[in-house]
């Protein structure tokens, strides 16, 4: 299945993270979420084929990209208090 | 310190075929797509197409396919371009670059001039 | 295929002068990136993701736009910034380049 590390992290704000997203082999595609009990489930962003192809509104301080092995980041930079939240990830062929 | 090292200016005659050269330090090669940028004389980029280190796929502009071929050599960390029936058309100075992984190049190589003519 | 458009396509600035060069494109894109290459070197990443500035790019340099419209703007020219600027996006499955804004020293 999809693999996400670390599953939990605490950190303090100004602080920047990455999230680590492997997809289920075969999987070109992968798409980032942001959960909170506020907002519900936001698309941050797709990528495919190690490209960028859709993103949510968020701001520039979040930012992921995709290795050429499908393996995907997202790295938050600057962190708020807004910003804790559960981070989904997603994979598709 | 992440280097993308190109092979030296080449001189051919028209209808030849040329193979350039890229090889990458510094980083885990099959991490980051290459992709080949093609800069005529005094004009401005043109995207060839990309090849993917990990799995060997590619992708190429359209307008390309018929005259590149991209390949790679894992076990020396490097990507190649093939390029077939040369006109003066061809003519320019080749790129590789080291995609960033979401939607713009990072790191760029010095460039490969190739001159076609007879 | 998406065309990138740049104005003006040459450019001239004093010393001290602030310079803005545009991108266009013929129809939306996510992000839009820019490089500088000066004359007989390879283009360098100068503003990627619309706003944010490469390692090294002086703070003088900003980036700003959305949607088809995109702007790179020098708020105090200096004779190092003398050179060509391209604009680049990606929609899949294309990478376009604009043609270039030529910027020199007045």
């Known amino acids: 299945g999809v693999t996400q590390t670390p599953r939990y992290l605490i950190k303090t704000r100004g602080q920047q993270v990455t999230l680590s997203c492997s997809p289920i082999s075969g999987h070109r595609s992968v798409s980032w979420y942001q959960q909170t009990p506020g907002q519900g489930l936001q698309f941050l962003f797709e990528y495919f084929s190690e490209t960028q192809r859709n993103k949510g509104n968020f701001p520039g301080r979040f930012s992921g990209r995709q290795f050429s092995n499908s393996r995907s980041e997202m790295n938050v930079s600057t962190l708020e208090l807004g910003d804790s939240a559960l981070y989904l990830c997603a994979s598709s062929l | 310190e992440v280097q993308l090292q190109q092979s030296g200016p080449v001189l051919v005659k028209p209808g030849a075929s040329v193979r350039m050269s890229c090889k990458a330090s510094g980083y885990t090669f099959t991490d980051y797509n290459i992709h080949w940028v093609k800069q005529s004389h005094g004009r401005s980029l043109e995207w060839v197409g990309y090849?993917?280190?990990?799995?060997?796929?590619?992708g190429y502009n359209q307008k390309f396919k018929a005259k590149a071929t991209l390949t790679v050599d894992k076990s020396s960390s490097t990507a190649y371009m093939d390029l077939r029936s040369l006109t003066s058309e061809d003519s320019a100075v080749y790129y590789c670059?080291?995609?960033?992984?979401?939607?713009?190049?990072?790191?760029w190589g010095q460039g490969t001039t190739l001159t076609v003519s007879s | 295929e998406i065309v990138l458009t740049q104005s003006p396509a040459i450019t001239a600035a004093s010393l001290g002068q602030k310079v803005t060069i545009t991108c266009s494109a013929s129809s939306s894109v996510s992000y839009m990136h820019w490089y500088q290459q000066k004359s007989g070197t390879s283009p360098k990443p100068w503003i990627y993701?619309?706003?944010k500035l490469a390692s090294g790019v002086p703070a003088r340099f900003s980036g700003s736009g959305s949607g088809t419209s995109y702007s790179l703007t020098i708020s105090s020219m200096e004779a190092e910034d003398a050179a060509i600027y391209y604009c680049?996006?990606?929609?899949?499955?294309?990478?376009?380049f604009g043609a270039g804004t030529k910027l020199e020293l007045k």
């Open positions: 090849i993917n280190p990990y799995n060997g796929r590619t």
């Open positions: 670059a080291r995609w960033d992984g979401s939607s713009y190049f990072d790191y």
């Open positions: 993701e619309i706003s």
């Open positions: 680049q996006q990606w929609n899949y499955p294309l990478l376009t």
